[in-house]
């Protein structure tokens, strides 16, 4: 009695299971009752990723540099090509099909973690002793300046943007 | 002068072969990206693939994919394009273009785009029994 | 795939007057960088493309001021402010946010 269903990595065509094709490789004809499946190797710049009866390959993506992407992995005949953004830009998504350019921390806020090919740069207020100045994409919060350290007092106060003016302590008339 | 010059046309029967070459002068080949672009008699403008500078990634329109190759040796400062299984709707002028870019440095030129600013003169494939 | 319409598909034009083309494209060629990545290219009779005009509205090296690009997402036009006799021949745009790339049919100019 032909089969209903067929072992993994089969298929079952004409009432019986056939091999399907392994990674790398696409269908080129189906068994029979005397020939085994056969199977034909994906040609440079294709793949298939999964066991399959795909007549035709993928072709791996195009990392495209109009939209500020590169190759980080080229692809196989198993694998897709994997995509990056150039340096100062991050994927907008996790398929990496476009880039967007680092977000920069404005003044208050400091760079927690800078930015990736993959990750946007993530930024957090500056806290109390700490200030920022500049908008960046790169440079964490600083502390501010000890006066003390410099003999010397704090004239105006900090803030999470502006550090200490320090200034000279007043002598006391003899 | 920046100059592509292709070759490799002719007249070829259904099914058979044929390579082009588009031999590139005046600057430096292995820093641009190159596509090929075809023109049928009469007709518009249909582009046919892309490949990257090192050569490491390329793709291919729907309508060759499976029997057109785009390769290149930039040592040899060339581009080719290797047609098999060649169909009678493949006759066309083909056309080599270069991707014009902008040089890198400041945050936005990495991917600053300079439109396909410099095209060879064509090779005519003729695919006829 | 991104389709791309121009009109009109044929123009005749007065030496001294200004044209104007327009393509559409099916989806917007706005990408996140604020560039519009639409181009448009020339093929005089008998010779190869040339570009005129790249992401959107910037006019290539060499080509005369009376060419302009302009439009944004989906809408754009390229104009000619004063046609000249040398301007004839098929005016394409393509789109380059997208592989594959894909042009407009064509424009044919031709002096009236």
């Known amino acids: 009695e032909p089969p209903t269903a067929c072992r993994e990595k089969q298929y079952l065509i004409n009432s019986q299971c056939c091999s399907l094709c392994q990674p790398g490789q696409k269908l080129v004809s189906d068994c029979t009752e005397f020939t085994e499946t056969e199977c034909l190797p994906c040609s440079e710049s294709e793949f298939l990723d999964t066991w399959n009866r795909e007549t035709r390959c993928h072709q791996h993506k195009y990392c495209d540099p109009n939209l500020g992407l590169r190759v980080q992995q080229k692809g196989t005949s198993e694998t897709d090509t994997i995509c990056t953004c150039e340096e100062g830009l991050h994927c907008m998504s996790e398929s990496c099909e476009s880039c967007v350019p680092h977000r920069s921390c404005l003044p208050g806020f400091g760079v927690k973690q800078i930015a990736t090919g993959v990750s946007d740069t993530i930024c957090e207020p500056c806290p109390v002793g700490f200030f920022s100045n500049v908008s960046s994409a790169f440079e964490k919060c600083r502390p501010w300046t000890s006066c003390e350290t410099k003999d010397l007092v704090v004239q105006q106060a900090g803030t999470n943007k502006t550090d200490v003016v320090c200034g000279p302590q007043d002598r006391q008339r003899a | 002068q920046v100059q592509l010059v292709e070759s490799g046309g002719g007249v070829v029967q259904p099914g058979r072969s044929l390579r082009l070459s588009c031999a590139a002068s005046?600057?430096?080949?292995?820093?641009?990206?190159m596509h090929w672009v075809r023109q049928a008699p009469g007709k518009g403008l249909e582009w046919v693939a892309v490949?990257?500078?090192?050569?490491?990634?390329?793709y291919h329109a729907d309508s060759v994919w499976g029997r057109f190759t785009i390769s290149r040796d930039n040592s040899r400062s060339t581009l080719y394009l290797q047609m098999n299984s060649l169909r009678a709707e493949d006759t066309a002028v083909y056309y080599c273009?270069?991707?014009?870019?902008?040089?890198?440095?400041?945050?936005?030129?990495?991917?600053?785009?300079?439109?396909?600013?410099?095209w060879g003169q064509g090779t005519t494939v003729t695919v006829s029994s | 795939d991104i389709v791309m319409t121009q009109s009109p598909l044929s123009l005749p034009v007065t030496p001294g007057e200004p044209a104007s083309i327009s393509c559409r494209s099916s989806?917007?060629?706005?990408?996140?960088?604020?560039?519009?990545?639409l181009d448009w290219y020339l093929q005089k009779p008998g010779q190869s493309p040339q570009l005129l005009i790249y992401l959107g509205s910037n006019r290539a090296s060499g080509v005369p001021d009376r060419f302009s690009g302009s439009g944004s997402g989906t809408d754009f036009t390229l104009k000619i402010s004063r046609v000249e006799a040398e301007d004839v021949g098929v005016y394409y745009c393509m789109q380059a946010l997208q592989t594959p790339r894909t042009f407009g049919q064509g424009t044919k100019v031709e002096i009236k």
């Open positions: 989806q917007s060629l706005l990408y996140s960088n604020g560039y519009n990545f």
């Open positions: 273009a270069r991707r014009g870019m902008g040089s890198s440095g400041s945050r936005g030129d990495y991917y600053y785009y300079y439109g396909l600013d410099v």
């Open positions: 490949i990257s500078n090192d050569g490491d990634n390329k």
């Open positions: 005046g600057f430096t080949f292995s820093s641009y990206g």
